[in-house]
């Protein structure tokens, strides 16, 4: 049964209706709507816009529009009892105190509910001590330390810059080093943009402004006390001592003014080079402890947080496919904010907002997709993508039998200079067409395609005329579909210019100042960057769920595979004699990849060919390249890492939002000359380069003839 | 439809105790705590405190601390206060609302339709 | 604990008139105040939450404002289902603490 034979429409006209539908005025709306006040995850606030997304959900036409809540670890700061930094004299007197709140912006001075700033998760505490300056607190950064410079970390606060790298990365790492604290801040020369105004005249960082955020090191394993199984009312919870990824030192988050206080103060060794100078007036001096003058000052940090279980709710809307219900494309995004969320998530939240609406009205006429969509209002991503993790443990054993594909929809934008797209190679063919099929909104791209605009501004590095499409990582909402389940997956947005923008992430991220404002009059006054995004994410939705042949291209995993084993060939290259010495061989690795992109190129042709009148031959083709990305998954999961299953892809080990290739050969290699047993170093890289090799293999023979 | 259903009128003698209850029904009774609020004859209204049956968390007034404790039965969707050392003052209705069990919330939405406890030698 | 001092304690007023009763707050309290309505045999009813929003159900007559410590709700046109006795209550901090009441009566 084709698909035509669930409405009297023509799949492209389908296609066409939907797009159509989709309207800037109404992402505008949704967004305003949203965005008034906080939605911080566990709070009445957020139940409520929960359901009232459940009853806007049921009013556009889905089928059914469901809460599912989960009890899961949260952190909030002790609301009579606030967390701040302060600089103490010989005496132990408060001589300096950090902000404990951000200035409100303008119009939001009466808003009750705005969280102070704090880092998610910290345990509570009040050290007190010299001050190290750790730059971004990256992997490189405590080895230039600790190796080059001779600096000891231990027994010390740290302060690092945010950007680079995932907080909570920086947080282990500071915790390694033997740090008995850390004070996070926001650097003008990382989110403070040159030539731009400061909030409410511009989009930059004002001094007062602080990011939140959580400081976990979950690897995917959801709720801290609950890790592989749902939060359900009868879940069994670890005690605090057994949770996952939790720090054990106190950390907290500043703005640039009170950093700037902090760091004019420190004396010790000069910054290594210019790479650890940020923008303010200060040395950059690395410590540890302040300058002569200063010397018997110290730092003292005041952290009161706490740890509460507590009741989440995603919204999690269905429209049944008329031809395979019991195939699933999901589409995601969290609902939860940190304070008004104008772009994280609300700018993606609206997005999905109106491509529901424009689903519910075709369904309103009559039309069905082939494949069940599932709609999902995430909660407590902030809080370590906890919602769509407890979902998907609750939901597993449904999902790796019939998820067909993830697609992720938090911020719509972070910049609005061009696409950004990350996902799955088997998504490659399918982002090309159809962006090939929409307009451009960029300037000077009229009557363009976006594909046009996006390959000119942001070129793939390997192919000419291409658009670059980057590995997934993780951060969002996608991790748990991804690399704990292997379902196929992507996300979409509109970004910045890299080149001439080097600061991290936007300036605004996961402050107070994240408002509506914000987007309508420094981002996106049309609205037509989150229209272009809303077709980019509907249209891909759209076309997983609805075409005949699911529109996945294998050949281009074939290339990827290449390219990924050429890569950690040559790393592992980098120590020809141990290679050597420890008869180390990455045959086995080529020649699956060889055999794989013959397999996938064979699978291709039989696709080009296959009778599709034929229901079960269809089904059959249409399995196998849904499966294919399962294929990928070993059950035993990482080293260490058990929730991360992805044998071709995972999150960096030294930065949680960066994807790896081949991880495990990666973090195998990784500082191999530095241990102590090469021997039983080398064997570790030996057995990874063998995982690797049998799961590319086995994946290619999913693809084979199956008879 | 969210309601909160109390048990009837009482009389105590000073120095008894009393048990009011409070039947929840209409939404999912461990998403949302209960609070306790008097109201003595002619008088405005006291907040004595709140239980959240989610966590087993009271959180009582100074004022009642010691003489008041709250309990709830989450197989059967009721929470209990118990006030004791009852003096003629406590006369009163004692009303039972329902509060969001979250670190914001927006206090008391719905509210039972109260208790009247009369102490009298 | 925060105090709340409302006025006036008592009103008459008609069919029609507008009506504003205010609450202040002896400490900031932000928007976490609700207005509550209890009819004469008792029944209690939320009319406003965190200042200014409107309960389900609640006809539009009524409306909720800030201005600085000060709370006011504002009945546009009373009608008669409207002869009660009002309250503010804080909920910034424990013990929550409630206005002494304005009691609406028929002029």
């Known amino acids: 049964k084709s698909s035509n034979e669930a409405t009297n429409i023509t799949p492209k006209h389908n296609m066409k209706a939907f797009l159509d539908e989709l309207k800037a005025e109404n992402i505008k709306k949704f967004l305003y709507n949203f965005t008034q006040i906080p939605h911080l995850a566990g709070t009445e606030q957020n139940f409520q816009l929960a359901k009232q997304i459940q009853s806007q959900w049921k009013e556009f036409g889905l089928d059914s529009v469901e809460l599912a809540h989960y009890d899961v670890l949260l952190s909030y700061p002790n609301k009579t009892h606030p967390n701040y930094i302060s600089i103490i004299n010989e005496d132990g007197n408060e001589i300096f105190n950090t902000s404990l709140f951000e200035p409100p912006p303008p119009g939001y001075e009466n808003v009750s509910d705005i969280v102070p700033p704090f880092s998610a998760f910290s345990p509570q505490g009040m050290p007190e001590g010299d001050l190290v300056y750790v730059n971004y607190a990256r992997t490189e950064d405590f080895f230039k330390l600790e190796r080059d410079m001779k600096i000891n970390c231990s027994g010390k606060i740290v302060i690092a810059r945010y950007g680079k790298v995932f907080r909570g990365n920086k947080v282990k790492n500071a915790q390694l080093a033997g740090a008995k604290g850390v004070i996070l801040y926001s650097d003008p020369a990382d989110y403070f943009a040159p030539g731009v105004k400061s909030y409410p005249d511009g989009w930059n960082l004002p001094g007062g402004g602080v990011q939140r955020g959580n400081i976990l090191n979950l690897n995917g394993a959801g709720d801290p006390l609950t890790p592989g199984y749902p939060a359900n009312e009868y879940a069994y919870r670890r005690g605090i001592a057994e949770a996952v990824g939790l720090p054990s030192i106190p950390v907290h988050p500043i703005g640039y003014y009170d950093a700037q206080k902090l760091l004019e103060k420190m004396g010790g060794s000069a910054p290594p080079d210019s790479s650890w100078r940020g923008s303010l007036k200060v040395p950059y001096n690395v410590g540890p402890g302040f300058t002569g003058n200063f010397s018997t000052q110290k730092v003292k940090m005041h952290i009161h947080s706490t740890n509460e279980v507590t009741r989440i709710y995603n919204v999690i809307g269905t429209l049944r496919g008329a031809v395979e219900p019991d195939r699933y494309v999901i589409l995601g995004g969290h609902r939860d904010s940190w304070v008004f969320g104008g772009i994280d998530p609300q700018s993606g939240a609206a997005v999905v907002h109106e491509i529901v609406r424009s689903f519910g009205t075709l369904k309103k006429e009559g039309w069905r997709p082939r494949r069940t969509i599932l709609f999902a209002s995430w909660d407590a991503e902030e809080f370590g993508l906890l919602g769509s993790t407890e979902w998907a443990e609750e939901n597993s054993r449904l999902l790796q039998e019939r998820g067909v594909a993830y697609i992720n929809a938090d911020s719509s934008i972070e910049g609005n200079y061009t696409l950004r797209v990350d996902c799955t190679p088997l998504m490659y063919s399918l982002v090309h067409n159809l962006t090939k099929e929409l307009k451009s909104p960029d300037e000077g791209f009229e009557g363009k395609s976006l594909y046009e605009s996006w390959t000119k501004k942001s070129p793939s590095p390997e192919f000419s005329g291409m658009p670059r499409i980057s590995k997934l990582g993780s951060g969002n909402d996608f991790e748990v579909f991804f690399q704990r389940l292997g379902i196929a997956s992507g996300r979409a947005r509109y970004t910045k210019n890299w080149e001439t923008n080097k600061f991290s992430g936007y300036p605004l991220y996961h402050s107070v100042y994240e408002t509506y404002e914000l987007v309508e009059k420094f981002y996106d006054p049309m609205f037509k960057y989150h229209l272009t995004v809303a077709q980019v994410r509907g249209g891909m939705v759209f076309e997983l769920a609805n075409s005949i042949v699911l529109p996945f291209d294998c050949r281009d995993y074939a290339v990827v595979l290449r390219k990924y084993a050429d890569k950690i060939y040559s790393i592992s290259m980098k120590h020809p004699q141990e290679m050597k010495t420890y008869s180390v061989s990455f045959d086995s690795l080529f020649s699956a990849v060889k055999n794989f992109t013959e397999i996938a190129s064979k699978f291709s042709e039989r696709l080009q060919d296959f009778d599709k009148s034929n229901p079960i031959v269809l089904r059959m083709m249409n399995d196998q390249l849904m499966f294919l990305e399962r294929a990928f998954i070993d059950p035993l999961g990482l080293p260490d890492r058990p929730f991360y299953r992805h044998v071709i892809y995972a999150p960096s080990s030294h930065n949680k939002y960066a994807g790896e290739s081949f991880p495990g050969i990666y973090d195998a290699l990784f500082d191999i000359e530095s241990k102590v047993d090469p021997s039983k170093a080398w064997g570790e890289v030996k057995r990874q380069i063998y995982v690797a090799a049998f799961t590319v293999q086995a994946a290619a023979e999913t693809l084979s003839e199956v008879a | 439809e969210v309601q909160l259903v109390q048990s009837g009128a009482e009389v105590k003698k000073p120095g008894a105790s009393v048990k009011v209850s409070c039947k929840a029904s209409?939404?999912?009774?461990?998403?949302?705590?209960i609070s306790w609020v008097r109201q003595a004859p002619g008088q405005g209204l006291e907040w004595m405190g709140e239980?959240?049956?989610?966590?087993?968390?009271?959180y009582y007034n100074e004022k009642f601390r010691g003489r008041v404790t709250m309990t709830t039965d989450k197989s059967t969707s009721t929470a209990y206060m118990e006030l004791r050392s009852l003096r003629s003052d406590d006369t009163a209705v004692y009303y039972c609302?329902?509060?969001?069990?979250?670190?914001?919330?927006?206090?008391?939405?719905?509210w039972g339709q109260g208790t009247t406890v009369t102490v009298s030698s | 604990d925060i105090q709340m001092t409302q006025s006036p304690s008592s009103l008459s007023a008609s069919v029609g008139d507008r009506v504003t009763i205010t609450c202040r707050a002896s400490?900031?309290?932000?928007?976490?105040l609700n207005w509550l309505q209890q009819k004469p045999g008792g029944a209690i009813k939320r009319l406003i939450y965190?200042?200014?929003s409107l309960d389900s159900g609640v006809p539009s007559r009524f409306s909720g404002s800030r201005s600085g410590s000060d709370y006011t709700l504002t009945i546009s046109s009373l009608q008669p289902e409207d002869f009660a006795t009002y309250y503010c209550?804080?909920?910034?901090?424990?013990?929550?603490?409630f206005g002494g009441g304005t009691k609406v009566e028929i002029k």
């Open positions: 609302a329902r509060v969001f069990d979250g670190y914001y919330n927006y206090a008391m939405d719905y």
């Open positions: 209409g939404y999912t009774f461990t998403s949302y705590g």
């Open positions: 239980i959240f049956p989610r966590r087993g968390n009271t």
């Open positions: 400490q900031d309290i932000g928007s976490s």
């Open positions: 965190a200042t200014s």
């Open positions: 209550l804080q909920y910034a901090s424990s013990p929550y603490t």
